[in-house]
Interface confidence: medium
């Protein structure tokens, strides 16, 4: 008996061929011997089966001795043995229809689980293999679960169902809802304007939810909420904002925050959370602010940084176009009795400058200008 696999919602064509290459009488029946369709001369006739409105054939092939049964919009319950009666012969075809669906929604938050459920006809024992867009292979039976979805899991999942050594392939588009970056760091000189951006890694037609930025300043004992906002159809509206600092927020996506000036008391780490309508859980993005200040007090030239710096970052003080006078893996460096000129304070990582602040040291005495 020939086995044909079909996909729920798809169209299948079951073949039936006569030895004579001409139009002769044929009938398609199901396993209960109920007529589905056949011919009367050159006319298509239909029986009382459940498939009535979804069954068809190709009249153009009848003259070649081919009498296919076409079933549209396949349902799991269409799984059956179909019998083609032609030339006193019976050709049997077993049709098995499968469906593969994602749990509840194909838009899932980063870190959530994806469950794919296989609908299969009674008596079948299929197995499923799926491959994620990042090339991860998983296998299962009637259900297949992937925990802790990552951003790279967004895209088309390719799943293959195997039954009776035959395969049918499904494609499922999964969207992982997440920020483009899990974490970012901004380096600024004291007094500079700070721009924080939180681009999303997905696009949807309508995006509604609410968000908040909590900030843990390095100098503060506890974190505080800097701003709360609503998102309605991609339009941003601020609900509440602290007076110090007074953040400004862009009205459109991507989410964009402006801190009027970088000050040591603001240096630290923030966590922006976004709760989306009809979704359990929240999206998170960490943001860090490092602030640099260079000062001269009497005979002491000091450079300091505040905020979450890694221990491998180097802080240096150097006179322009000269070797560094001092370089340390510390958050403050100084030079006593600095010579006059333009001094540079540099924060660097493996030779790459992340932040630079210049300060001019004036001579303590001036020579008279020669006439």
């Amino acid at each position: 008996k020939k086995v044909v696999l079909g996909k729920k919602g798809d169209t299948v064509e079951l073949t039936c061929t006569a030895s004579q290459k001409k139009s002769i009488q044929f009938h398609w029946k199901n396993s209960n011997q109920i007529k589905i369709l056949g011919n009367q001369g050159s006319f298509l006739t239909k029986g009382p089966s459940k498939l009535n409105d979804r069954a068809d054939s190709r009249r153009s092939l009848w003259d070649q001795g081919n009498f296919p049964l076409i079933i549209k919009n396949l349902k799991i319950e269409d799984s059956d043995t179909y019998i083609c009666e032609v030339e006193d012969q019976k050709e049997e075809v077993q049709l098995l229809v499968f469906g593969l669906t994602a749990n509840s929604d194909t838009h899932l938050l980063q870190g959530q689980s994806l469950t794919l459920t296989l609908e299969s006809p009674p008596g079948s024992s299929p197995s499923v293999q799926c491959r994620s867009p990042r090339g991860k292979n998983i296998q299962g039976g009637k259900t297949l679960s992937v925990s802790q979805l990552e951003l790279q899991d967004s895209g088309t999942w390719t799943c293959t169902v195997l039954q009776n050594q035959k395969k049918v392939e499904f494609k499922i588009d999964i969207v992982v809802l997440a920020f483009q970056k899990a974490s970012s760091i901004v380096y600024k000189k004291e007094g500079e304007q700070v721009e924080f951006s939180f681009p999303l890694a997905f696009t949807v037609e309508k995006l509604t939810g609410s968000g908040e930025l909590w900030w843990q300043a390095e100098r503060a004992s506890s974190s505080k909420s800097w701003i709360t906002f609503d998102l309605k159809n991609k339009e941003v509206s601020v609900k509440r904002v602290t007076q110090d600092p007074k953040l400004q927020m862009g009205k459109k996506l991507p989410l964009h925050l402006t801190l009027p000036q970088a000050l040591p008391q603001y240096a630290g780490s923030g966590n922006l959370t976004l709760a989306l309508e009809a979704k359990t859980g929240k999206l998170h993005q960490e943001v860090n602010l490092v602030v640099m200040r260079a000062t001269q007090l009497q005979k002491n030239l000091t450079c300091e940084v505040w905020g979450p710096t890694s221990p491998k970052l180097m802080l240096s003080l150097k006179l322009e176009n000269k070797e560094a006078k001092v370089s340390k893996r510390e958050k403050a460096v100084w030079v006593l009795n600095p010579e006059a000129g333009m001094w540079q304070c540099l924060l660097s990582d493996s030779g790459q400058v992340l932040l630079e602040s210049n300060i001019k040291v004036l001579p303590t005495w001036s020579t008279p200008v020669q006439p």
């Epitope: 090339g135 390719t158 195997l162 395969k167 392939e169």
Partner: antibody, heavy 118, light 108 residues
Framework: EVQLVESGGGLVQPGGSLRLSCAAS????????MHWVRQATGKGLEWVST???????YYPGSVKGRFTISRENAENSLYLQMNSLRAGDTALYYC????????????WGQGTTVTVSS | EIVLTQSPGTLSLSPGERATLSCRAS???????LAWYQQKPGQAPRLLIY???NRATGIPDRFSGSGSGTDFTLTISRLEPEDFAVYYC?????????FGPGTKVDIK
């Protein structure tokens, strides 16, 4: 007879491009994953690329952005477009068939040699 | 990236002896996704084992595969003269679909 025959190898200068082809016969080409694997002289096997039955493509970091795998099911052909070639890409390139279900490369071609040198 | 380590690098044995080749993964690999290949000089590789323990078509039963998680083994129960070759393991669990560096089985 199930067979894979590679072609398109040759000598190319660093930075140049080359397109490898693999002609498949004796099996239903569209039903199988197809792979490219390379082997430098005296060295081990290195996976270069995979294309699934649904056209999904996979690459290691060493070739991502430079190489593109593609298939033409109607012509039973597999291709590897190699751009921005480097000396390190010099190798014998094999085309291999992979069953999407029983993972393993069960049919291999004899390979085509790519030499990148100035 | 899953790194596969094969040991020993070279195995020197006589015909008729038993060969045990090891393949260790840097992280767990489902046994479904582990394959073994044989390669002789001047020839293309040949699939021996798929799914960690299933012999490919036409492979003699002296070849067997076992293991799970991070440790996999290819065993040749009695070496025949034609078995002296290089053997590679490969994982298909996660892209990149890496190969091990190979184990050379040569005649003592």
């Amino acid at each position: 007879e199930v067979q894979l025959v590679e072609s398109g190898g040759g000598l190319v200068q660093p930075g140049g491009s080359l397109r490898l082809s693999c002609a498949a016969s004796g099996f239903t080409f569209s039903s199988y994953d197809m792979h490219w694997v390379r082997q430098a002289t005296g060295k081990g096997l290195e996976w270069v690329s995979t294309i699934g039955t649904a056209g999904d493509t996979y690459y290691p970091g060493s070739v991502k952005g430079r190489f593109t795998i593609s298939r033409e099911n109607a012509e039973n052909s597999l291709y590897l477009q190699m751009n921005s070639l480097r000396a390190g890409d010099t190798a014998l390139y094999y085309c291999a068939r992979g069953d999407y279900y029983y993972y393993g490369m069960d049919v291999w071609g004899q390979g085509t040699t790519v030499t990148v040198s100035s | 990236e899953i790194v596969l380590t094969q040991s020993p690098g070279t195995l020197s044995l006589s015909p008729g002896e038993r060969a045990t080749l090891s393949c260790r993964a840097s992280q767990s690999v489902s046994s479904t996704y582990l394959a073994w290949y044989q390669q002789k000089p001047g020839q293309a590789p040949r699939l021996l084992i798929y799914g960690a323990s299933n012999r490919a078509t036409g492979i003699p039963d002296r070849f067997s595969g076992s293991g799970s998680g991070t440790d996999f083994t290819l065993t040749i129960s009695r070496l025949e003269p034609e078995d002296f070759a290089v053997y590679y393991c490969q994982q298909f669990g996660t892209s990149p679909f890496t190969f091990g560096p190979g184990t050379k089985v040569d005649i003592k």
